[in-house]
Amino acid sequence: NFMYSKTVKRLSKLREYQQYHPSLTCVMEGKDIEDWSCCPTPWTSFQSSCYFISTGMQSWTKSQKNCSVMGADLVVINTREEQDFIIQNLKRNSSYFLGLSDPGGRRHWQWVDQTPYNENVTFWHSGEPNNLDERCAIINFRSSEEWGWNDIHCHVPQKSICKMKKIYI
C-alpha cells in the first residue's frame, strides 16, 4: 500500500513535467530506493542541477525565454567546479550566453535567478568586462586563457546554456 501510494505520487509528478520533457533520465540517490533524481533526456546532470546546451543561435532575451519555456533559466555559475563541468560539453569555436547581464549599463551585473553577484566567484577573461554597451555575458574559449567570460551586445545571436534544478521523485 505504501509502495503503491509512492508510485502514484511519482506518476503524478512525472505528468507535471511531461509537457516540456517527455523523457526523463533518473538515478537513485544514495542507498534509499525511494529517492530518485531526474534530468530531462538528453540534459546532463551535475550535483543538484541539470544542464542543456542550446545550439540554436538567439539573442540573450530570446535565449532566456527559450530556457524558461523548458522550466529552466540561462545558466548561473556558482563555483569553479560547476564551470569545469559545463565546459566539458562546449565547443571551443562557439560562444554561449550565461544568465548574467547588466541591463542598466552601470556594471551592476545580475544573475537571472537573483543569486547575488559575487566578484570573487567570477571567471572573466583578462580585461573583461570592457564595454558599457555590451550588457550580456557569454562563456567562450581563448587559446591564451582557456574558457572564460566576456561581455557582448545582448541582441547578437549566440548559443546558450540552460540550467534547472533536478527533479526529485
Epitope: 538567439q58 539573442s59 532575451t61 570592457n130 564595454n131 555590451e134 550588457r135 551586445h153 547578437v156 545571436p157
Partner: antibody, heavy 121, light 111 residues
Framework: EVQLLESGGGLVQPGGSLRLSCAAS????????MSWVRQAPGKGLEWVST????????YYPDSVKGRFTISRDNSKNTLYLQMNSLRAEDTAVYYC??????????????WGQGTTVTVSS | DIVMTQSPDSLAVSLGERATINCKAS??????????VNWYQQKPGQPPKLLIY???NLESGIPDRFSGSGSGTDFTLTISSLQAEDVAVYYC?????????FGGGTKVEIK
C-alpha cells in the same frame, strides 16, 4: 553637437570594391558602438554592420557577410566600411549612425547625411 | 529573422488631425517589461531621425504630439495633431535580435 560625415561613395562596376569613411566629431567616439545602415533608391532601411567601441566585435547580416568589413580608427575618430565583391543590389545611400544601448536592445540615435554607392556596368 | 510589417503604406491626414501608424513584428520583441521597438522619421533628402525608443519613450527634443504604444508583436506610432513639418516617411525597427530589421515605411501626407 554630434556630427557624422560620410565619404567615399561613387560609381563602381559589379565585382569591384569601395571603402567608405565616416568622420565623427562632437562626442567621445572611442566609447561608442557604431553602425552602418543603407537605403536603396526609393526603398526602406537595411542594417549593414555594427562594431563595438574597441573594434574587437563586429556584426553583419547574411546579405553582406564575407563581403563587407567594418573597422574603426579611434585615434582618427573615423569609422570605415570596406565593401568588396559589390553587386547591383548594394546600390544605396550608406549612413553611419551612433548606437545607444537601451536595456537589452539599442537605438540608432544620430545619423550622418549619407554617401551614395552605385554599382553598375 | 524578425519581420516588421507596417500599415498602411501611405496615409493622408488633414492638418491638426490624428495620424496612426501600425507595426507588427513576426514574433514578440518584449522582455522583462520592455519592448525593443524604435520609430524613426525620414524627411525627403534627409537621414532618418529617432522619434521613439523602447516602444513608448519619447526621444529628447521630439515634440510631444508624437507618441508610441504597444507590446509583444503590435505597436503604434501616433501623431496627435498633424503639422505641415510632419510630412515624412516613418519606419519602425526592432532591436531585440540581430539582424536589426525595419518596417517597410509609411508615407504621411497632408490631405
Amino acid at each position: 553637437e554630434v556630427q557624422l560625415l560620410e565619404s567615399g561613395g561613387g560609381l563602381v562596376q559589379p565585382g569591384g570594391s569601395l571603402r567608405l569613411s565616416c568622420a565623427a566629431s562632437g562626442f567621445t567616439f572611442s566609447t561608442y558602438t557604431m553602425s552602418w545602415v543603407r537605403q536603396a533608391p526609393g526603398k526602406g532601411l537595411e542594417w549593414v554592420s555594427t562594431i563595438n567601441s574597441g573594434g574587437d566585435n563586429t556584426y553583419y547580416p547574411d546579405s553582406v557577410k564575407g563581403r563587407f568589413t567594418i573597422s574603426r580608427d579611434n585615434s582618427k575618430n573615423t569609422l570605415y566600411l570596406q565593401m568588396n565583391s559589390l553587386r547591383a543590389e548594394d546600390t544605396a545611400v550608406y549612413y553611419c549612425a551612433t548606437y545607444r544601448p537601451y536595456y537589452y536592445g539599442s537605438v540608432l540615435d544620430y545619423w550622418g547625411q549619407g554617401t551614395t554607392v552605385t554599382v553598375s556596368s | 529573422d524578425i519581420v516588421m510589417t507596417q500599415s498602411p503604406d501611405s496615409l493622408a491626414v488633414s492638418l491638426g488631425e490624428r495620424a496612426t501608424i501600425n507595426c507588427k513584428a513576426s514574433q514578440s520583441v518584449d522582455y522583462d517589461g520592455n519592448s525593443y521597438v524604435n520609430w524613426y522619421q525620414q524627411k525627403p533628402g534627409q537621414p532618418p531621425k529617432l522619434l521613439i525608443y523602447g516602444a513608448s519613450n519619447l526621444e529628447s527634443g521630439i515634440p510631444d504630439r508624437f507618441s508610441g504604444s504597444g507590446s509583444g508583436t503590435d505597436f503604434t506610432l501616433t501623431i496627435s495633431s498633424l503639422q505641415a513639418e510632419d510630412v515624412a516617411v516613418y519606419y519602425c525597427q526592432q532591436s531585440d535580435e540581430d539582424p536589426w530589421t525595419f518596417g517597410g515605411g509609411t508615407k504621411v501626407e497632408i490631405k
